[in-house]
């Protein structure tokens, strides 16, 4: 309950915060749990305690372990634990999952990526930023204070972003890197009364007797994820499944999201071996959502065979 996980890379600075909070004037004692050995407060040590903070300048793989902090208040002592893991630097570009900080989401309107844990360090701007190990260049990227701003965010901007900065302690500089994933989410969606794109209202569809015919019902419902949206076909006001004609079946087409962000659905009506009686039916394309229902009616007509006689 009073434990927090911290991690870092060998030869980089790592600063860890005691999970128990107290007043700035409270004394905080730190111990290495395995040996119960007190962590010194003298800054000349590579690992030293500074109030609520435990500093590894720089960190070594052997520093990994559980550290205990005790916040001494006037009436009781609060004990917390910092579970520290120091990893070897990877030779390749990939950042393993165990080194990743929490994923953040952005959108066209809000594309800030905060550099994780940076508030613990004594750093000066600017930060360096990398995406999938490549240094970010171009006017779309702006390093501002402790975060990166991306202008005109696109889905391709999703990926792993690493911030790199220098921690200064008593005139000595130490490198720090931190990586987190960035995902791009759609702007807040909205819902509209359904708009049927096809077929046109009262369309006449020419078909050939004995051949197969397809009718597509296509409608759009708004932008972004839709809570309730459906398209379907009816025959003479009856659902296809209830109509009982095995030659006539409907199957879902592709869910579409156009470049303008509209959320649309398709339903294809497949008529096998078109018969004369099919021309007498009324085919209704229905689109419905929370706003209501829209219906476009189609009728079939016989396609005149091409006259080959002169």
């Amino acid at each position: 309950k009073f434990s927090k996980q911290s991690w870092g890379l060998e030869n980089e600075a790592l600063i860890v915060r005691c999970p128990r909070q107290g007043k700035p004037s409270y004394t905080v004692d730190w111990y290495y749990s395995q040996t119960n050995k007190s962590i010194p407060t003298q800054e000349r040590n590579r690992v030293f305690a500074s109030g609520q903070l435990l500093k590894f300048l720089p960190a070594a793989v052997a520093d990994s372990g559980i550290y205990t902090c005790i916040v001494r208040s006037p009436t009781f002592n609060r004990t917390g634990y910092a579970n520290v893991t120091i990893y070897k630097k990877q030779s390749d570009c990939n950042v393993p999952d165990y080194l990743m900080y929490s994923t953040v989401s952005g959108s066209e309107k809000n594309s800030k990526i905060y550099c994780p844990t940076i508030d613990l360090y004594n750093w000066t701007a600017p930060l360096e930023w990398f995406k999938n190990c490549q240094a970010l260049q171009g006017s779309r990227y702006r390093a501002h204070k402790s975060f990166l701003v991306i202008d005109n965010v696109m889905t391709e901007d999703a990926g792993d972003y690493t911030c790199k900065f220098i921690h200064n302690e008593n005139g000595a500089n130490y490198s720090v890197t931190a990586t987190r994933s960035f995902t791009v989410k759609d702007e807040q969606g909205f819902s509209l009364f359904p708009v049927i794109g096809a077929p046109a209202q009262n369309e006449i569809k020419e078909v050939e007797i004995g051949k197969n015919a397809n009718l597509t019902c296509s409608a759009c419902f708004g932008k972004g994820t839709q809570f309730l949206a459906a398209v379907l076909w009816q025959l003479n006001g009856t659902k296809i499944t209830d109509f009982g004609e095995p030659r006539i079946q409907q199957e879902e087409g592709q869910n579409q999201s156009f470049s303008n962000g509209l959320a649309c659905l398709d339903m294809v009506l497949r008529i096998a071996d078109v018969k004369e009686e099919d021309l007498l039916l009324q085919y209704d394309c229905l689109a419905l959502n929370l706003h209501g229902l829209r219906r476009h009616t189609v009728r079939l007509s016989r396609k005149n065979p091409i006259d080959h006689h002169s």
Epitope: F2, P19, R20, Q21, K23, S25, S73, P74, T75, G80
Partner: antibody, heavy 116, light 113 residues
Framework: QVQLVQSGAEVKKPGASVKVSCKAS????????MNWVRQAPGQRLEWMGW????????TYGDNFKGRVTITRDTSASTAYMELSSLRSEDTAVYYC?????????WGQGTLVTVSS | DIVMTQSPDSLAVSLGERATINCKSS????????????LAWYQQKPGQPPKLLIY???TRESGVPDRFSGSGSGTDFTLTISSLQAEDVAVYYC?????????FGGGTKVEIK
């Protein structure tokens, strides 16, 4: 600069619950605990409890245990105080105040009126 | 719980004169671990949240005029306004910042005579 902005005034019926929010800005939210203090009309200030914003551990004053719930959302840098089973004596201004050596930063206050 | 008792309840002082407010705690607010007295003083004006003036019994919060000073140790504490100004008209509270539950005094109303 440090700012604590609280949600607006509420009018509640006896027996109901109220949830007050306190959005922090101008500092790293998880670095400091958040206290809740209330002030009934003509009464002294009364400490309700606080939350360790780093690990989410709350501590409640004895007078409020069982009725108060203090939570936080680190992604929104916001602390919340929910008081249940409201009675007319709970009519008060509720403040959030940042922990430190005493309370140097306070929210503007949220007036909660309990009336049938 | 630590009970904080303030005196007087109200105080009328001429502009430029000294105002003294006392606060007594039912238990010592001195922490032997660091020799700090965990007592704070606040000023509150109508319709506003309290404003921290003094913490640690005698440390002035940054931005607070130096006419405000705090003293005392253990269970007896004093807030002094050396030369009262018109803007100092308010209610003043002492607070136990030592142990839970943090408790406040009943307040002292300072007015101009």
């Amino acid at each position: 600069q440090v700012q604590l902005v609280q949600s607006g005034a509420e009018v509640k019926k006896p027996g109901a619950s109220v949830k007050v929010s306190c959005k922090a800005s101008g500092y790293t939210f998880i670095n400091y605990g958040m206290n809740w203090v209330r002030q009934a009309p003509g009464q002294r200030l009364e400490w309700m409890g606080w939350i360790n914003t780093y690990i989410g551990e709350p501590t409640y004053g004895d007078n409020f245990k069982g009725r108060v719930t203090i939570t936080r959302d680190t992604s929104a840098s916001t602390a919340y105080m929910e008081l249940s089973s409201l009675r007319s004596e709970d009519t008060a201004v509720y403040y959030c105040a940042r922990e430190g050596d005493a309370f140097a930063y306070w929210g503007q206050g949220t007036l909660v009126t309990v009336s049938s | 719980d630590i009970v904080m008792t303030q005196s007087p309840d109200s105080l009328a002082v001429s502009l430029g004169e000294r105002a003294t407010i006392n606060c007594k705690s039912s238990q010592s607010l001195l922490y032997s671990g660091n020799q700090n007295n965990y007592l704070a003083w606040y000023q509150q004006k109508p319709g506003q949240p309290p404003k921290l003036l003094i913490y640690g019994a005698s440390t002035r919060e940054s931005g607070v005029p130096d006419r405000f000073s705090g003293s005392g140790s253990g269970t007896d504490f004093t807030l002094t306004i050396s030369s009262l100004q018109a803007e100092d008209v308010a209610v003043y509270y002492c607070q136990n910042d030592h142990s839970y539950p943090y408790t406040f005094g009943g307040g002292t109303k300072v007015e101009i005579k």
